[in-house]
Amino acid sequence: APTSSSTKKTQLQLEHLLLDLQMILNGINNYKNPKLTRMLTFKFYMPKKATELKHLQCLEEELKPLEEVLNLAQSKNFHLRPRDLISNINVIVLELKGSETTFMCEYADETATIVEFLNRWITFCQSIISTLT
């Protein structure tokens, strides 16, 4: 059966989110600088469960800390200024989860590094895309 236009739109939004998150991850992994060590000391909250679009609330709540860590890097590896990058991500997250969502995010007990955090949300996006295909 042909994929509905709303599903296609969701897929494209998830692809865009993936692109932004992978750009950040690449930028961090390419960052041959002592600042990388400091970036890895920052801790991020991870979702207890992330299987549905509403769980993007957990990502949204961590965008400000993410921006702060990226500002620390002051790197050209991110292709865009951190503020613009996070703004892009925020817009997409709001569109995907819906701005009316009143979902209360539950976090895991263990915190994570920025690399683990990004990997978790990239995995989430890829997983949702796969279920929609």
Epitope: E15, L18, L19, Q22, M23, L25, N26, N119, Q126, T133
Partner: nanobody, 118 residues
Framework: QVQLQESGGGLVQTGGSLRLSCTTS????????MGWYRQAPGEQRELVAV???????NYADSVKGRFTISRDNTKDTMYLQMNSLKPEDTAVYYC????????????WGQGTQVTVSS
């Protein structure tokens, strides 16, 4: 090291056509998802078109029916055929290729300028 190189950009009049190419050097597996995004000065980056390893395509509403994405895995090349161009399509166009499994490597080109004059 994998590198992507865009070509085919330029100046065109409203209603005209351009075909962008994205050639990869190094190994880009046919299973990678590839796509095109564009960035206009002062604007948010816009994902224009995507093509999966299996050939499934997806387009932004703003280009649907006018742009066509395709790939030729035998030539390690991806294309974006742009028809009925509008001034609002003016931007730098970047191609990218991303792994769909960990470690989630992402590659993108330097971009090619597309200018549509009215």
């Amino acid at each position: 090291q994998v590198q992507l190189q865009e070509s085919g950009g330029g100046l065109v009049q409203t209603g005209g056509s351009l075909r962008l190419s994205c050639t990869t050097s190094g190994t880009i597996f046919s299973g990678y998802t590839m796509g095109w995004y564009r960035q206009a000065p002062g604007e948010q980056r816009e994902l224009v078109a995507v093509i999966s390893g299996g050939g499934d395509t997806n387009y932004a509403d703003s280009v649907k029916g006018r742009f066509t994405i395709s790939r030729d895995n035998t030539k390690d090349t991806m294309y974006l055929q742009m028809n009925s161009l509008k001034p609002e399509d003016t931007a730098v166009y970047y191609c990218y290729s991303r792994e769909v499994t960990p470690p989630w490597k992402l590659y993108w080109g330097q971009g090619t300028q597309v200018t549509v004059s009215s």
